[in-house]
């Protein structure tokens, strides 16, 4: 039985301030059942960046078509990047439950922000 893999192919991404950053994440299977969420940072103090069902994330959009069937691409795009957005972003798979239980995290993608070219 192959174990679910959460793949963040880029270890780091560098973006100019004001531009958009694309953070890539794919999974190897549609199961176990449960959502994907994105966080900045690790551990108990991590910041939720994107969760489709709950919250309002005006600067974050999924890269793939939200009506695409059997989607395994959970990449996101963050618009209007500022230096405050720098950090390591994790794509995390949860197992459905009450509450959902964290199952596996990607290796993380470090986002660095360059000064806007003059």
């Amino acid at each position: 039985e192959e174990e679910l893999q959460v793949i963040q192919p880029e270890k780091s991404v560098s973006v100019a301030a004001g531009d958009s950053a694309t953070l890539n994440c794919t999974v190897s299977s549609l199961i176990p059942v449960g959502p994907i969420q994105w966080f900045r940072g690790a551990g108990p103090g991590r910041e939720l960046i994107y969760n489709l069902k709950e919250g309002h994330f005006p600067r974050v959009t999924p890269v793939s078509d939200p009506t695409k069937r059997n989607n395994m691409d959970f990449s996101i795009r963050i618009s209007n990047i500022t230096p405050a957005d720098a950090g390591t972003y994790y794509c995390v798979k949860f197992r459905k439950g009450s509450p959902d239980v964290e199952l596996k995290s990607g290796a993380g993608t470090e986002l660095s922000v360059r000064a806007k070219p003059s």
Epitope: E1, E2, L4, S28, S29, L30, I31, P32, V33, G34, P35, I36, L52, K53, P62, S64, D65, P66, T67, K68, R69, N70, N71, F74, R95, K96
Partner: antibody, heavy 120, light 108 residues
Framework: EVQLVESGGGVVQPGGSLRLSCAAS????????MSWVRQAPGKGLEWVST??????YYADSVKGRFTISRDNSKNTLYLQMNSLRAEDTAVYYC???????????????WGQGTLVTVSS | EIVLTQSPATLSVSPGERVTFSCRAS??????IAWYQQKPGQAPRLLIY???SRDTGIPDRFSGSGSGTDFTLTISSLQSEDFGVYYC??????????FGGGTKVEIK
Amino acid sequence: EVQLVESGGGVVQPGGSLRLSCAASGFSFSIYAMSWVRQAPGKGLEWVSTIGADDTYYADSVKGRFTISRDNSKNTLYLQMNSLRAEDTAVYYCAKDSTVGWSGDFFDYWGQGTLVTVSS
Amino acid sequence: EIVLTQSPATLSVSPGERVTFSCRASQNVRSDIAWYQQKPGQAPRLLIYAASSRDTGIPDRFSGSGSGTDFTLTISSLQSEDFGVYYCQQYYDWPPFTFGGGTKVEIK
């Protein structure tokens, strides 16, 4: 072409057991969640159970009595039904789950169903 | 548990007519609604998912709309093969997945 073929239905006395099987073909069985949905005679559809990998989910009406399982090497889904009651009488459908976007599951392919009758 | 209420329970329609089915959820389900058609003696068939996306091979006379708690399935011009029972299903909050009670379409 996706195919789901159920078997194992029949007549059983109250308190008895049955094991339903669903043979799947035409898709990568091991990466999809699978479900059982039933329909009592002349009634609507009722979700029974879903299995992901080793994660399982049940309707309250069958929890503790029914067990869903799968054998990915055989592309087969199972439903072990114990302590059967008259109200479990229904056509049992095997269904392939489909996900959309980042969201939940619905059922994009269904088998033809197998009839389970619980009667003394 | 989210309750789905379909109305009307039965519709008597002539071929060629426009038909509208309603599905109301007891709480917000965003756009996480699917519609199925079931003909007598047959398994259900997926028509619409994500409230408005037609499944592969479904004729364009079938369309879905709505979000939140109120959803509609429309058949723009009913064909003889469209008679049967239509069910909505929510997959926003589960378990359990829940289905509406169905709307039966009969020949007038």
